[in-house]
Interface confidence: medium
Amino acid sequence: AGVFELQIHSFGPGPGPGAPRSPCSARLPCRLFFRVCLKPGLSEEAAESPCALGAALSARGPVYTEQPGAPAPDLPLPDGLLQVPFRDAWPGTFSFIIETWREELGDQIGGPAWSLLARVAGRRRLAAGGPWARDIQRAGAWELRFSYRARCEPPAVGTACTRLCRPRSAPSRCGPGLRPCAPLEDECEAPLVCRAGCSPEHGFCEQPGECRCLEGWTGPLCTVPVSTSSCLSPRGPSSATTGCLVPGPGPCDGNPCANGGSCSETPRSFECTCPRGFYGLRCEVSGVTCADGPCFNGGLCVGGADPDSAYICHCPPGFQGSNCEKRVDRCSLQPCRNGGLCLDLGHALRCRCRAGFAGPRCEHDLDDCAGRACANGGTCVEGGGAHRCSCALGFGGRDCRERADPCAARPCAHGGRCYAHFSGLVCACAPGYMGARCEFPVHPDGASALPAAPPGLRPGDPQRYL
């Protein structure tokens, strides 16, 4: 267990041209506050994914009113550190999001209004117990300077806060194989926490004497690989000898989530879904009310009359989630019909329609044939946002204006000669062949391969292609 600490040094205009306008004015005084969100690992996740390592809100800073005509200075900051307690091991690599929020204190009807001024994010490596790390991040024309560190809470020590320290039993030195606990030289490192023999690669522990297995491994010491075949119990395989998972105690047994949180298993551990008003790995941190500004992206917080009642965030269009933390991908609902391109402009949705379609959602199929005549007796056919002409015999082209040469495609088989005709084409067949396209051979005995020759035609006569 331990605490991640964040110290904001300054928030103000960054270097270079285009200094931002002050967020506060004489008409609209305001004050700043900050929110930090931590996630384990070098996560590329979106800003709205859960703050699995924890989150914290700062206090409000002093009220600030801009001096007319003066450039935006560094803005007055809240006192104190932002502290994010973590219950389990410090992961060593983490992702952070730091948001700077403005609370407007003008004559707002219904209380103060909040708006997000800047959001910075990054991924860092950090050992617990190390010195403060300094950082500078830019968001648009704003610059945020801050320091951070992770420190273990006694009795935990080490770069991941997983080693435990105990007061020395003897004044002079620690027991066999145990080192002094830097920086607490008067304490000794506690014996190994995990069960003896627990696989260092495939097992881990959070309590002394236990051995919990990573996904894919089983057995009392996590040394048996799991085979998923021939295992029928609800938790999967059921005996260490066959390499099957034992339906032993799961991480959610006994529900480690406090304050009515619901527990769900994860490959390594568990995750708590906390009721509103509680947060932290085990929902152990309480007391979030509307006064803490839990609604982001301009959401309106409506709170109950007493601490037992939940608050609710009413989100502006384009945002959702219990704290308005998620941007709505309204285009994912595919509102644009007929293959239109969806554009989410934030304040509104727009559909860019394909040719032949119109309307706010491309729902209107324009009459492709309106005002488009097909020449030479052709008929117009609508479809797919473009018109086409079905041409009368002997004509072709987009509008049936071109006279077609029916012989151009050499339609007469077996050396037959093609003649253009007012109603199409005629094939004069070579000796030994017959049919509209000279496709049928004539048998030597005079019978044809056709079931019967059309009346009035002898084999070898030209066949008119109708």
């Epitope: 009807i109 309106l300 009359a305 939940a310 009413h314 219990s322």
Partner: antibody, heavy 118, light 107 residues
């Protein structure tokens, strides 16, 4: 499509309790708040309270705190409202309504008519 | 609690008319206002949310406007199926409150 099914009517005796149900279908039940609204004959609508199925959070209109208890059964996607110590004042139509993601009651049940009579 | 007042409890109009129903709040509600339609059979439907956003499937003849404490619902071209009671509802503060309703009838 989103549907909220409520039984048509309940007849109960004064002093008794009644548990009204609202079965949801066509959407992810655990992701949306469920509201309950009262309408007395010939009168307007009155908000009773709301419950979040995943979190179990509730928020009541102070006026109904000692009258109504909201619960859910996630396995059957059903919201419940229990009304206790019934009097003739509780004779009304009770609606359940889903709170949409933009804070409007976007889908309503048909309502259950509760008659309190001896 | 925030009081929502619909001063006109009933109004009569002809088919094709433009009808406006008004609603006022006892304090500013920053556009956090919805409109609902209740048909004679008791069915309730959302029409407008956040003062002026049209709910999906609602005909475009319905529109909403307003700010601060005063809001209105307009039906631009009255049709027979619009016979109903119309309610406004604020969600700026708990408890959510509804107006008393405006009953719309055809002349």
């Amino acid at each position: 499509q989103v549907q909220l099914q409520q039984p048509g009517a309940e007849l109960v005796k004064p002093g008794a309790s009644v548990k009204l149900s609202c079965k949801a279908s066509g959407y992810s039940f655990t992701s949306y708040w469920m509201h309950w609204v009262k309408q007395r004959p010939g009168q307007g609508l009155e908000w009773i309270g709301m419950i979040h199925p995943t979190l179990g959070d509730t928020n009541y209109n102070e006026k109904f705190k000692s009258k109504a208890t909201l619960t859910v059964d996630k396995s059957s996607s059903t919201a419940y409202m229990e009304l206790s110590s019934l009097t003739s004042e509780d004779s009304a139509v009770y609606y359940c309504a889903r709170l949409g993601s933009l804070s409007m009651m976007d889908y309503w049940g048909q309502g259950t008519s509760v008659t309190v009579s001896s | 609690d925030i009081q929502m007042t619909q001063t006109t409890s009933s109004l009569s109009a002809s088919l094709g008319d433009r009808v406006t129903i008004s609603c006022s709040a006892s304090q500013g509600i920053s556009n956090y206002l919805n409109w609902y339609q209740q048909k004679p059979d008791g069915t309730v439907k959302l029409l407008i949310y956040y003062t002026s956003s049209l709910h999906s499937g609602v005909p475009a003849r319905f529109s909403g406007s307003g700010s601060g404490t005063d809001y209105s619902l307009t039906i631009s071209n009255l049709e027979p199926e619009d016979i109903a009671i119309y309610y406004c509802q604020q969600y700026s503060k708990f408890p959510y409150t509804f107006g008393g309703g405006t009953k719309l009838e055809i002349k």
